[in-house]
Every structure is written in structure tokens, then in C-alpha cells.
């Protein structure tokens, strides 16, 4: 059988080889398509409800005014010329429809390095056969399930036209220190050969590199946190992040009921001020981050350093916030 590829909605003429060019003709066409069960016979004298789909022209050719999906199948003509010689023609008809240019919808303008991000959804509408969607990064094909690339695909068929809508959602995990403006595009490859791919307009999201959080530093004055009774201790919370986060203070793991401040002053230290102190920096984008804990202790006269003794009561004594 001769393979014929026809575009949906377009006319198609199939020649009946060996048929006399004009009536009277001894010929018949037989169709086995999505519109028939087994074979449907059409003759030149025909003329009827099938004419909207296929009719025999005066020259014996079969004319399909607007090919549809249901016209895929086998078409055979059997003709006898004036001398009684029989000729058979056999066609295998396949149909196709090229969709509109694919589009990337819900595209991200910014991606975050090191974490999975949805880049966008590629949509192609009105293809037959279904065909495929593929993604490209800087012009090179992206392979799903490799190097942080994942693709979620969906195929739907229109209940009336039978044409396909394809959707492909791309997720990527950009490498840290990679291209700050990668170029993504998507292309539709038809299900039938000899038709070139259709490509979307590219998108270029920015890649945002999250700055690794530097540690919250807690600086104690005097160094070591050991002070004579009645002395003063100054705790300073240093956070490199911009904008400056809110700083709260903890003592022995319990938040101190004080307004936020980067400096905590403990004047006139008494036993009740002894304990373990830390600060908590709260960033709007990252959440809370706690410093190391430092131990504040009282040195009795004649001692060299912090006592190994017990922590005093939980009384706050007199605190000053700078």
C-alpha cells in the first residue's frame, strides 16, 4: 500500500489507477476507516450521505473534501479499463494536525539555587497524533531525572475534535555558582515524521543564590564571663546579615522578657545573674538563629577565674539594655 499523509481539514484526492478518464467506468472504491466497520463500497453512481466524507469524481479519483481523524485507514480502488484489464490501487492514509506554537505558562521569574524550583509549564494545543514536548536549557536538551531535572507530563484529548493538548511542567534544582540567567525553552515534536519541531519563545529567569547564613557571634565583656560581685557584664550579639535582624535574649534556655536589642548589659552582678546566656537573631527570610551559649559567673575575691559552682537563682537582678 502507498502511504499517504494528509493534514486534517484539508482536501485529499486519491487516484484510481487504470480507470478510464471519464464515464462510463467500471470501478469501485472500498474504504476501511474509522467511519466504517469492515469495508464500505463507494461507486461513481453513488452520491449520498457519504459525499460529505468521500465521493468518486468523474475521472474515477476519490475526493475527500476535508480529511478528519476518522478517515485514517485503507482505501482501495479496483478499476477495469476499456480492454477489460483490471488495475488495483491501495492507499494507507494517515492524518495529522500541527498544533499552534507551544507556550510556556506560569513561568518563574526567579529560581533559588540549591533547591527544586518550578520553571514553568509548557502547553501545546491541537496536535494529532499527540507528539511530544521536550525542554531545553541554553539550547541543549534537558534529560528528566538527571541532575536535578524533573518533568511532569499530562496529555488530554478534546472530546469532539479528537485533537491533543499536551502539558509538561519542568522542575529544576540550579547548581550553586551556576549560570545566573539560564535560558529555558520548550519544543513540540510532531508524532508523524518529516515535520520540524515547534519551539516556544525562551524564558530567562534569574537564579538567586541564598547567602549562607554566617554564625551569630556572642561577644562577652569581660572575656570569659567571670566577674567580681557588683561588676558589670556586657553581652553583644553580632549578626552580619542585612537588614539587621531582631535580637532576643535567653537565659538558661528561657527567653528573657525584654525588648529586642543587640546589646545586653548586666550591671551590679549578683548571684541571681549567674547562668548561661545566648542571643537569638530572627531574620524575616530565614527564621530564628541562635548564638553559642556563654556562662556568666561570679568570682569570689582571691579566685582566678570562673567558679565551677552552681548557677544562682533565676532572679534577673538589675539588667540594662543598650
Amino acid at each position: 500500500a502507498q502511504n499517504i499523509t494528509a493534514r486534517i481539514g484539508e482536501p485529499l484526492v486519491l487516484k484510481c489507477k487504470g480507470a478510464p478518464k471519464k464515464p462510463p467506468q467500471r470501478l469501485e472504491w472500498k474504504l476501511n476507516t474509522g467511519r466504517t466497520e469492515a469495508w464500505k463500497v463507494l461507486s461513481p453512481q453513488g452520491g449520498g450521505p457519504w459525499d460529505s466524507v468521500a465521493r468518486v469524481l468523474p475521472n474515477g479519483s476519490l475526493f475527500l473534501p476535508a480529511v478528519g481523524i476518522q478517515d485514517e485507514g485503507i482505501f482501495r480502488c479496483q478499476a477495469m479499463n476499456r480492454n477489460g484489464k483490471e488495475t488495483k490501487s491501495n492507499y494507507r492514509v494517515r492524518v495529522y494536525q500541527i498544533p499552534g506554537k507551544p507556550e510556556i505558562v506560569d513561568s518563574a521569574s526567579e529560581l533559588t539555587a540549591g533547591v527544586p524550583n518550578k520553571v514553568g509549564t509548557c502547553v501545546s494545543e491541537g496536535s494529532y497524533p499527540a507528539g511530544t514536548l521536550s525542554w531545553h536549557l541554553d539550547g541543549k536538551p534537558l534529560v528528566p531525572n538527571e541532575k536535578g531535572v524533573s518533568v511532569k507530563e499530562q496529555t488530554r484529548r478534546h472530546p469532539e475534535t479528537g485533537l491533543f493538548t499536551l502539558q509538561s511542567e519542568l522542575m529544576v534544582t540550579p547548581a550553586r555558582g551556576g549560570d545566573p540567567r539560564p535560558t529555558f525553552s520548550c519544543s513540540f515534536s510532531p508524532g508523524l515524521p518529516r515535520h520540524r519541531a515547534l519551539r516556544t519563545a525562551p524564558i530567562q529567569p534569574r537564579v538567586w543564590e541564598p547567602v549562607p547564613l554566617e554564625e551569630v557571634q556572642l561577644v562577652v565583656e569581660p572575656e570569659g564571663g567571670a566577674v567580681a560581685p557588683g561588676g558589670t557584664v556586657t553581652l553583644t550579639c553580632e549578626v552580619p546579615a542585612q537588614p539587621s535582624p531582631q535580637i532576643h535574649w535567653m537565659k538558661d534556655g528561657v527567653p528573657l522578657p525584654l525588648p529586642p536589642s543587640p546589646v545586653l548589659i548586666l550591671p551590679e552582678i549578683g548571684p541571681q545573674d549567674q547562668g548561661t546566656y545566648s542571643c537569638v537573631a530572627t531574620h524575616s527570610s530565614h527564621g530564628p538563629q541562635e548564638s553559642r551559649a556563654v556562662s556568666i559567673s561570679i568570682i569570689e575575691p582571691g579566685e582566678e577565674g570562673p567558679t565551677a559552682g552552681s548557677v544562682g537563682g533565676s532572679g534577673l537582678g538589675t539588667l540594662a539594655l543598650a
Epitope: E37, G48, P49, W50, D51, S52, V53
Partner: antibody, heavy 119, light 107 residues
């Protein structure tokens, strides 16, 4: 919504002529074949004529061939049936219907118009 | 020409009954048969198209089936509004041919 409205029926003498019209709305008229079907009083349905969407091809049963002519004006969304040499047996309600080919066959009908052929 | 032989020409049934109407084509018409319902003084309404497909807005108690050249319309549970005349139509070839009709009456 699809609507088909027939008009032009009435009383006519044997041998006379009548022209029926069908005004179509609610769909793309030139995409569809159109058909006339009739029903004699107390009888069944009988196909009268069909026309393809372009108007180039027309189809009739032997009972009306050479007497009736189906036509259409796609610009006016209108279907017509010109009936000549009318006989008593042509007395019927005439319906216009959408379709008539194997793709769409008589999915919507008008309410009908009565033609009476009598002396 | 194709003949469509419809049977029975009339039947009496009660609400809730299962009703079956048959049309036999004199030659192969493929799937190209429709079923219509007509009430007195009204235009026909398509119920089933291409032998087995339920037309839009038609209750699911109506169904169509095909076995070769035999076509059947079934009403699974007859309702008061179903008392009417039913016709089959062959549209595979010209002349388009209707069955003679089946009048469904109240028992």
C-alpha cells in the same frame, strides 16, 4: 441555541407551486448539510431532499425528483424548497432539519409548516 | 433502496416497564442509524445517533444497540412522558429511509 423556523406553507391547488423557507440561527449554517423531511397527516416520516454545505450538490428521492428543488443562501442562513407540479399526495407537514450526511444526521428540527394540496 | 422494517407498529405498556423496539435494515448500513421520538403535533427529536450514542439532553433510560443489520431502541423504565411514536432512520445511503414508526401507548 440552534433554531430552525419554517415558513411558506399553505393551501395550493394541484399542479400549483409553493416555496418553503427555513431560517436558521444559533450555529454556523455553512458548515452543515440541510434536509427537508415531510409527514403526511397520520403517517410516518419521509425524506424529501438534502443539500450539501456549499449548495453545490443536491439529493432527492424519486418521488419528488424533477418537481422539487432544494437550495440555500449561506449569506442569509436560509434553506429553501421550491415545490412545483404539486399533487394531493404532497399534502404534509414539511420539516427542515440540520444534517443529512453521515457526519450529522438530522440532529435539530424546525417546528414544521403545513402544505395542503387540494382543489 | 434500503428498507427499514420497524416492529412492532404499536405497543401498550405501563409506567416502569422495559420497552424494546427493533428496526431491521434490508442491507448493511454500518452504524448509520438514528432513533427519533415524536409527540403529537410536535417535531421529531433525536434520541440516539449512530446506533448506540445517546444524544445530548436525552435521559439515560434510553439506549441503542446493534447486531449486524438489526437495531434496537430500549427504554429501561418507561416514564409518563415517554408515550409517543418512535422512528428509526437509515442514513448510510440515499434515499434516506425511515422505519414505519412504533406508537407506544398507555396500557
Amino acid at each position: 441555541e440552534v433554531q430552525l423556523v419554517e415558513s411558506g406553507g399553505g393551501l395550493v391547488q394541484p399542479g400549483g407551486s409553493l416555496r418553503l423557507s427555513c431560517a436558521a440561527s444559533g450555529f454556523t449554517f455553512n458548515n452543515y448539510w440541510m434536509t427537508w423531511v415531510r409527514q403526511a397527516p397520520g403517517k410516518g416520516l419521509e425524506w424529501v431532499a438534502s443539500i450539501d454545505n456549499s449548495g453545490d450538490n443536491t439529493y432527492y428521492p424519486d418521488s419528488v425528483k424533477d418537481r422539487f428543488t432544494i437550495s440555500r443562501d449561506n449569506a442569509k442562513n436560509s434553506l429553501y424548497l421550491q415545490m412545483n407540479s404539486l399533487r394531493a399526495e404532497d399534502t404534509a407537514v414539511y420539516y427542515c432539519a440540520r444534517g443529512g450526511d453521515i457526519i450529522i444526521s438530522l440532529d435539530w428540527w424546525g417546528q414544521g409548516t403545513l402544505v395542503t394540496v387540494s382543489s | 433502496d434500503i428498507q427499514m422494517t420497524q416492529s412492532p407498529s404499536s405497543l401498550s405498556a405501563s409506567v416502569g416497564d422495559r420497552v424494546t423496539i427493533t428496526c431491521r435494515a434490508s442491507q448493511d448500513v454500518g452504524i448509520y442509524v438514528n432513533w427519533f421520538q415524536q409527540k403529537p403535533g410536535k417535531a421529531p427529536r433525536r434520541l440516539i445517533y449512530r446506533a448506540t450514542n445517546l444524544a445530548d439532553g436525552v435521559p439515560s433510560r434510553f439506549s441503542g444497540s446493534r447486531s449486524g443489520t438489526d437495531f434496537t431502541l430500549t427504554i429501561s423504565s418507561l416514564q409518563p412522558e415517554d408515550f409517543a411514536t418512535y422512528y428509526c432512520l437509515e442514513f448510510d445511503e440515499h434515499p434516506l429511509t425511515f422505519g414505519g414508526g412504533t406508537k407506544v401507548e398507555i396500557k
